[in-house]
């Protein structure tokens, strides 16, 4: 049984205390109320690009 904070969840997933397992962050788009969604970061910003005049 995983203890939260010891072994991180795979990329794109987050620990659910309600389910005691890592859950896919993609499901948070359909159901944002899930407890593990708090640990899912937003999509990374687009690469920074300098705009020269």
């Amino acid at each position: 049984e995983r203890v939260p904070g010891t072994t991180p969840c795979p990329r794109g997933s987050s620990w659910s205390a309600d389910l005691d397992k890592c859950m896919d962050c993609a499901s948070c788009r359909a159901r944002p109320h899930s407890d593990f969604c708090l640990g899912c970061t937003a999509a990374p910003p687009a690469p920074f690009r300098l705009l020269w005049p």
């Epitope: 049984e1 205390a17 309600d18 389910l19 005691d20 359909a30 159901r31 109320h33 407890d35």
Partner: antibody, heavy 120, light 108 residues
């Protein structure tokens, strides 16, 4: 065969306490989330409480928060509901139910229920 | 809280009839809707999960449809053992779930 068997119901006076048990058999109990649902006489179903597979996370309906405590003993394959400060409106049949194996989207097995009557 | 409203509250039908029960959510719940059957003095029994998936062992005359706020349970040809009360349940806000008030299917 999956079975859930509730016990511990009975007649109790307002302000009293009861502890309900739900004995699970026929499946590996520890990976499953569990809930308690109640049904007042002649009424519909009301969710009461939820517990995660390890027992580390619990949730309650506002109507019972602070009075009821859900717990589980995975070594005994048993779910519990400690009910304190009971009120007349807690009178109901109490059911335990097993959550789905991938999420808690649905509840696929239910016990037969145990009747709790709160009356003086 | 999400409220679930079923209609009708009760209905009378005959064996062989096609029966439709509706369930409306107070806000969108996507497809996170389940249906249960309950007979007097018995525990609820899962029929349909995630709006349209038939639970193992449930006869194919039961079907579910819908998404968002409006859902339907259909019994294509009512059988004597189908006279019972049916409940919808939303799991969009799991583990904080809510049930509809129930629809009683009686013999005409």
């Amino acid at each position: 065969e999956v079975q859930l068997l509730e016990s511990g119901g009975g007649l109790v006076q307002p302000g009293g306490s009861l502890r309900l048990s739900c004995a699970a058999s026929g499946f590996t109990f520890s990976p499953y989330p569990m809930i308690w649902v109640r049904q007042a006489p002649g009424k519909g179903l009301e969710w009461v409480s939820y517990i995660s597979p390890s027992g580390g996370s619990t949730h309650y309906a506002d109507s019972v928060k602070g009075r009821f405590t859900i717990s589980r003993d995975n070594s005994k394959n048993t779910l519990y509901l400690q009910m304190n400060s009971l009120r007349a409106e807690d009178t109901a049949v109490y059911y335990c139910a097993r959550g789905g194996d991938t999420y808690f989207d649905y509840f696929d097995y239910w016990g037969q229920g145990t009747l709790v009557t709160v009356s003086s | 809280d999400i409220q679930m409203t079923q209609s009708p509250s009760s209905l009378s039908a005959s064996v062989g009839d096609r029966v439709t029960i509706t369930c409306r959510a107070s806000q969108s719940i996507s497809g996170y809707l389940n249906w249960y059957q309950q007979k007097p003095g018995k525990a609820p029994k899962l029929l349909i999960y995630q709006a349209s998936s038939l639970q193992s062992g449930v006869p194919s005359r039961f079907s579910g449809s819908g998404s968002g706020t409006d859902f339907t349970l259909t019994i294509s040809s009512l059988q004597p053992e189908d006279f019972a009360t049916y409940y919808c349940q939303q799991s969009y806000t799991s583990p904080f779930i809510t049930f509809g008030q129930g629809t009683k299917v009686e013999i005409k």
